[in-house]
């Protein structure tokens, strides 16, 4: 049995898969901040995790996915306020008893040092310095992401 949060996550992922393919994003849109090959957008209001997930989708984006510790540190460097928490796209899957990213992959246990429990209705937030497990109903800010398309050099055959 999937929790309502897992259902919401799956529904959004499926609707995103159904949409027609858009041309690649070469530059970050206005108001978005570039971090390497991503564009990030930080919210200015608060929401529970599932509302945050849904709100990112209205911006044709997803809650932030973090590949590794290095990307976490670079993201945290963009956070200016010490005590503020932001939802990212990672929550506890009760059925698989593991932390699961909204793209369906599982957390590599070495990637993030999570403070708090791994249990039902737990979602992950980040601050300037740490990564926390919080009740998904907690009302905090969130970070959306869009992937930039890498520009590949065309290879021309010898003339």
């Amino acid at each position: 049995q999937k929790s309502s949060i897992e259902k919401c996550s799956v529904d959004i992922q499926q609707s995103r898969n159904k949409t027609t393919e858009r041309p690649g994003l070469l530059n970050c849109p206005i108001y978005w901040q570039q971090l390497r090959e991503k564009c990030l957008l930080f919210s200015h209001t608060v929401n529970p995790w599932n509302n945050s997930l849904a709100d990112c989708s209205t911006k044709e984006s997803s809650l932030l996915l973090i590949r590794d510790k290095d990307e976490l540190i670079h993201t945290q460097n963009l956070i200016r306020d010490k005590a503020i928490l932001f939802w990212i796209g990672l929550n506890f899957s009760l059925s698989e008893k593991n932390w699961k990213w909204i793209n369906g992959s599982f957390l590599n246990s070495n990637d993030l040092e999570i403070r708090g429990d791994a249990k039902e209705n737990s979602c992950i937030s980040i601050s300037q310095t740490s990564v926390y497990s919080e009740y998904c109903s907690t009302e905090i800010r969130w970070i959306c992401q869009k992937e930039l398309t890498p520009v590949r050099n065309k290879v021309y055959p010898d003339s």
Epitope: Y31, L41, F42, S43, H44, T45, V46, N51, I84
Partner: antibody
């Protein structure tokens, strides 16, 4: 058109509480975050905090954290700001202001203001 | 907290004049700066967001510029209805702060 209509002027004694209301019309009340900003006589503007009417979530300026409570009643599209343990320096005009975008911190519509006078 | 210092505090000008108001931030705020106009006894009115983007319905004589720590609001040709107070605001941090204001008076 978007309208934010606030409750009338209040006179309070030091130590008392005041509750100001802000009734929204002309847009989806739950679709925009409401903020409260105050302006003391002859002074600049000071941001107090926000409430997301959709979820009820709040975030307060640390300066007011122990004294302010922001609530809402979605059935009547109204936001409230209660400030307790009033002091004379809380004398100000209090505004509700709509956040224009979930991802930017500007206020695109304001109430007419509520004058709160704190005097013994 | 990020402090915003506006200058001048008072400005006397005539209809048709070009005027510039400056807002200096104590730290880099990128372009997360807003300008408001406020008339006596009235609520502030949004003019410009993101340092230079005019809000819907704001006349083109109002323009904003700047990034980092220095920002300006320019009114290219003052109209009688422009005499008012002007405030800048930053939202680079989640503790939003405002400048002290500039009172624009008729000379």
């Amino acid at each position: 058109q978007v309208q934010l209509v606030q409750s009338g002027a209040e006179v309070k004694k030091p130590g008392a509480s005041v509750k100001v209301s802000c009734k929204a019309s002309g847009y989806s009340f739950t679709g925009y975050t409401m903020n409260w900003v105050r302006q003391a006589p002859g002074q600049g503007l000071e941001w107090m905090g926000l409430i997301n009417p959709s979820s009820g979530g709040t975030y307060y300026n640390q300066k007011f954290k122990d004294r302010v409570t922001m609530t809402r009643d979605t059935s009547i599209s109204t936001a409230y700001m209660e400030l307790s343990r009033l002091r004379s320096d809380d004398t100000a005009v209090y505004y509700c202001a709509r956040l224009g975008d979930n991802y930017r911190g500007y206020f695109d519509s304001w109430g007419q203001g509520t004058t709160v006078t704190v005097s013994s | 907290d990020i402090q915003l210092t506006q200058s001048p505090s008072f400005l006397s000008a005539s209809v048709g004049d070009r005027v510039t108001i400056t807002c200096k931030a104590s730290q880099d705020v990128g372009t997360a700066v807003v300008w408001y106009q406020q008339k006596p006894g009235k609520a502030p009115k949004l003019l410009i967001d993101w340092a230079s983007i005019r809000h819907t319905g704001v006349p083109s004589r109002f323009s904003g510029s700047g990034s980092g720590t220095e920002f300006t609001l320019t009114i290219s040709s003052l109209q009688p209805e422009d005499f008012a107070d002007y405030f800048c605001q930053q939202y680079s941090t989640y503790l939003y702060t405002f400048g002290g204001g500039t009172k624009l008076e008729i000379k």
